[in-house]
């Protein structure tokens, strides 16, 4: 079959060679493979200015393998498409364009950001914290004795950070002022920092304002509880003086 | 030299098959892909569809469900059944050849046969 | 199916002119597009395959160029015999399609 197909090329093509390389059916000296061996994909290779025929078994990037009836060929994805399964379904977008649900897109659709690593569109993520930690004991300049004023911490953990459009974290510490019986330290005691001993419980009367620290207030969108105008601001000050317990700003 | 040469009636009656052969010479229908094109009269070509040199066939698909493509190799002949047919489908019917993507498409064509779809 | 835009549809002119007709397909076709020739009462014949190879024993006046989706079939130099109907052809997928045609005809 490949004689017969090799002398009939010759009558439209003078130079057809009668032993194919690469898997060519059919070739010719000009044009390189004009046709292919079962199973094997035509495709046109650019050699400088001119292109030739050449047979592959699997097609380049930017092509896909289109299969008819004993004739097949590469076939080129969509402009804004690197790599594709077929003409409507892409898998890789070339530059500047993201992927999703098999097209290439200038922009994600609502509801679904960029990301710009894998080049796709992909769902928001929102921020995700555990639940608040028990507060910390109460604390002075790392010891648990010897002060009435201190302060106490608690923290929560990040469980899902936000992707770029989700909502930022919300603190993820918080400090508030503290009392204690004033009670003097023990021998060994000096310098324990509270967390190396067991936390003690306030005593009856004593009350506490947490204050968010303000390293994580910085980095988080500001949230409707922290919101107040300065009249709010002006009384609380006011109320804070007349307890027997002050509270610091914001450290 | 390839030739080819159509044949088959000139007038078909509406809703009957219209039955083409082509008749081909100087190459074996065993190796190529011999094709169907027609061309209603004052107006453009369209493409029917393939018989492969294996017997494999395609056809397009706006007429898929009414087209057969079939072969008789020891008569190195193929033929065209379209089954249905009204007047839209008066034409002038061709056969023509082509051998794979890099070389000449078409490179053949028969003289056509004028087909009329009438009662 | 993709679509194969011709234009224009006729044209007139005079021997030696240089004539110009153009296809446009509904997406690119990468090169695989062909031009034929038809005269009256006869069948198509092919001058340009692959965007640009001539048939061999096609006059060299013809040419063909283009890339994507437009494509161009240039006379450079209009002979009395090439007064005629002209056809583009894409074959990238199939089903395959043609241009509406473009009539060339004496001024």
């Known amino acids: 079959q490949n004689a017969s197909r090799g002398r009939r090329q010759r009558r439209m093509h003078p130079n057809v060679s009668q032993g194919c390389q690469g898997g060519c059916a059919t070739c010719s000296d000009y044009n390189g493979c004009l046709s292919c061996k079962p199973r094997l994909f035509f495709a046109l290779e650019r050699i400088g200015m001119k292109q030739i025929g050449v047979c592959l078994s699997s097609c380049p990037s930017g092509y896909y393998g289109t299969r008819y009836p004993d004739i097949n060929k590469c076939t080129k994805c969509k402009a804004d498409c690197d790599t594709c399964f077929n003409k409507n379904f892409c898998t890789k977008c070339k530059s500047g364009f993201y992927l999703h649900l098999g097209k290439c897109l200038d922009n994600c659709p609502e509801g679904l950001e960029a990301n710009n690593h894998t080049m796709e569109c992909v769902s928001i993520v929102h921020c995700e914290v555990s639940e608040w930690n028990p507060w910390s004991p109460c604390t002075k300049k790392g010891k648990t004795c010897g002060f009435k004023r201190g302060t106490e911490t608690r923290v929560r953990e990040i469980i899902q950070h936000p992707s770029a459009k989700g909502n930022l974290c919300p603190p993820t510490n918080e400090t508030r002022k503290c009392t204690v019986q004033r009670k003097k330290c023990q021998k060994g005691e000096r310098g324990k920092k509270g967390r190396e001993r067991k936390r003690k419980k306030p005593n009856k009367g004593e009350s506490k304002e947490a204050i968010p620290d303000s390293k994580s207030l910085e980095s988080s969108k500001e949230i409707p509880e922290q919101r107040e105008n300065k009249q709010q601001q002006k009384k609380r000050k006011v109320q804070d003086k007349q307890k027997s317990v002050s509270v610091s700003t914001v450290h | 030299e390839v030739q080819l040469v159509e044949s088959g009636p000139g007038l078909v009656k509406p809703s009957e098959t219209l039955s083409l052969t082509c008749t081909v010479s100087g190459d074996s229908i065993t190796s190529g892909y011999w094709n169907w094109i027609r061309q209603p009269p004052g107006k453009g070509l369209e493409w029917i569809g393939y018989?492969?040199?294996?017997?494999?066939?395609y056809q397009n698909p706006s007429l898929k469900s009414r087209i057969t493509i079939s072969r008789d190799t020891s008569k190195n002949q193929f033929s065209l059944k379209l089954s249905s047919v009204t007047a839209a489908d008066t034409a002038v019917y061709y056969c023509a050849t082509y051998y794979g993507y890099g070389g000449p498409w078409f490179a053949y064509w028969g003289q056509g046969t004028l087909v009329t779809v009438s009662s | 199916d993709i679509q194969m835009t011709q234009s224009p549809s006729s044209l007139s002119a005079s021997v030696g002119d240089r004539v110009t007709i153009t296809c446009k397909a509904s997406q690119d076709i990468d090169s695989y597009l062909s031009w034929f020739q038809q005269k009256p009462g006869k069948a198509p014949k092919t001058l340009i395959y692959?965007?640009?190879r001539l048939v061999d024993g096609v006059p060299s006046r013809f040419s063909g160029s283009g890339s994507g989706q437009d494509y161009t079939l240039t006379i450079s130099s209009l002979q009395p015999e090439d007064f005629a109907t002209y056809y583009c052809l894409h074959y990238d997928e199939f089903p395959l399609t043609f241009g509406q045609g473009t009539k060339v005809e004496i001024k």
């Open positions: 018989i492969s040199y294996s017997g494999k066939t």
């Open positions: 692959l965007t640009n």
